[in-house]
């Protein structure tokens, strides 16, 4: 029995729950998730029951090896798998515990912008990125181009202060997960701050 | 990845004895059970047992104890057919096959074979 | 022994074509059948191992199906590459393992 495995899935995609035995005379191998039954495998007699039918062409055996594969990935097969091997030459049966996260491929995340102040031709507010339908454990980065040297900057939040005169500068927000990444579209600063010099109320972008 | 090579052709006397090696690489061989299947001209497949190199533990058809014996040198990677007492019938090609883990008895990787012809 | 009883031994069909090969066992073997194709000169090939589940790499026009003593392999569209014999096996529980006759499947 092995540390708990963490593995990432994207929704549509497969994984793979990697299990090895070298045991000779396996009886049983029984899989469960979040505590209800998945597969029964008898590699002696050959058989292999996955216990709800709508499952049955979502489970393979990669090489015919005892690793589980589960495609057609689903957000809410995210949880904990757990696989034991039953031997009659083992005193206690070999397990091991997963713990599988489903993500969704991101969309293109959403720009929202402050309130904005012009003063002495200094043009100051804050963008902020976020994604529509709250997916989880996304990242935010910005990058900044189009000054004398590019920039990042992390979190959802970027506050700007563009002096009217400078060169023009686009704003991007890269939105990432553990299995995708997708960008905003560009943000122009002068179209920005001319916008906001027009309206002193919050825009959207 | 996973290969199964096997000695060559062989032309044996009735009565004589042959033994047909199988050299394993690309996986565990002591791990996996190694089956012995025949096919003589023409004809369908025969299963005539298998063992487990880890320990030599060896299953037999009924049909060839006696007349096949199994081994297995895990040094080598290699399992060994030998064949005794031979007659005519038993003119085949002989595959060494490597079961699944997931299922036993089916086999996913096989020998390029091995003809043995016993002739007067 | 558990006899394994292929049919047809042989048949005709053109790419394309949907093709069904039966099994039939002598007694209960659950779900513990594997199908294998081969080709002239050349060792089987795993399709389909308990009853149907596909082998790594087998194309998707392979389907085996099945349980108890009666067991179907198909071919959903017959392409060149799978004119060869198909033989059946049954894996159930304690050896002997054994196969049906064979089914060759030839070129109308």
């Known amino acids: 029995s092995g540390p708990v495995k963490e593995l990432v899935g994207s929704v549509g995609g497969a994984v793979t729950f990697p299990l090895k035995s070298k045991v000779k005379q396996v009886d049983s191998i029984v899989w469960t998730f979040n505590t209800t039954p998945l597969v029964t495998i008898q590699p002696e007699g050959g058989t292999i029951i996955v216990t709800q039918n709508r499952n049955r062409e979502r489970v393979d055996f990669p090489d015919g090896g005892y690793s589980l594969k589960l495609s057609k990935l689903k957000k809410n097969d995210s949880g904990i798998y757990y696989v034991g091997i039953y031997s009659s030459s083992l005193q206690q049966p070999s397990t091991q515990e997963y713990v599988l996260h489903v993500y969704e491929h991101l969309s293109k995340p959403k720009v929202t912008m402050g309130l904005q102040s012009n003063k002495n031709g200094t043009c100051v507010t804050n963008l902020t990125c976020c994604m529509e339908h709250g997916e989880e454990d996304v990242i935010y980065t910005w990058k900044a181009l189009g000054q004398a040297a590019n920039e990042s900057h992390n979190g959802s939040i970027l506050p700007i202060s563009w002096r009217w005169g400078e060169s023009d500068m686009t704003f991007i927000c890269v939105a990432r997960n553990p299995v995708s990444r997708n960008f905003s579209s560009p943000i122009l600063a002068r179209k920005l701050c001319e916008g906001a010099a027009d309206d002193p109320d919050s825009s959207m972008v | 990845q996973v290969q199964l090579v096997q000695s060559g052709a062989e032309v044996k006397k009735p009565g004589a004895s042959v033994k047909v090696s199988c050299k394993a690489s690309?996986?565990?061989?002591?791990?996996?059970?190694m089956n012995w299947v025949r096919q003589a001209p023409g004809q369908g497949l025969e299963w005539i047992g298998r063992?487990?190199?880890?320990?030599?533990?060896?299953k037999y058809n009924g049909k060839f104890k006696g007349k096949a014996t199994l081994t297995a040198d895990k040094s080598t990677s290699t399992a060994y057919m030998e064949l005794s007492s031979l007659r005519s019938e038993d003119t085949a090609v002989y595959y060494c096959?490597?079961?699944?883990?997931?299922?036993?008895?089916?086999?996913?990787?096989w020998g390029q074979g091995t003809l043995v012809t016993v002739s007067s | 022994d558990i006899q394994m009883t292929q049919s047809p031994s042989s048949l005709s069909a053109s790419v394309g074509d949907r093709v069904t090969i039966t099994c039939k066992a002598s007694?209960?073997?659950?779900?513990?059948v594997a199908w294998y194709q081969q080709k002239p000169g050349k060792a089987p090939k795993l399709l389909i191992y308990?009853?149907?589940y596909r082998y790594t790499g087998v194309p998707d026009r392979f389907t085996g199906s099945g349980s108890g003593t009666d067991f179907t392999l198909t071919i959903s569209s017959l392409q060149p590459e799978d004119f060869a014999t198909y033989y059946c096996?049954?894996?159930?529980?304690?050896?002997?393992?054994?196969f049906g006759g064979g089914t060759k499947v030839e070129i109308k």
């Open positions: 096959a490597r079961s699944t883990m997931i299922a036993t008895g089916a086999m996913d990787y």
């Open positions: 690309g996986y565990a061989f002591s791990s996996s059970w």
């Open positions: 063992i487990y190199p880890g320990d030599g533990d060896a």
């Open positions: 007694q209960d073997v659950s779900t513990a």
């Open positions: 308990s009853a149907s």
């Open positions: 096996q049954q894996h159930y529980s304690t050896p002997p393992y054994t």
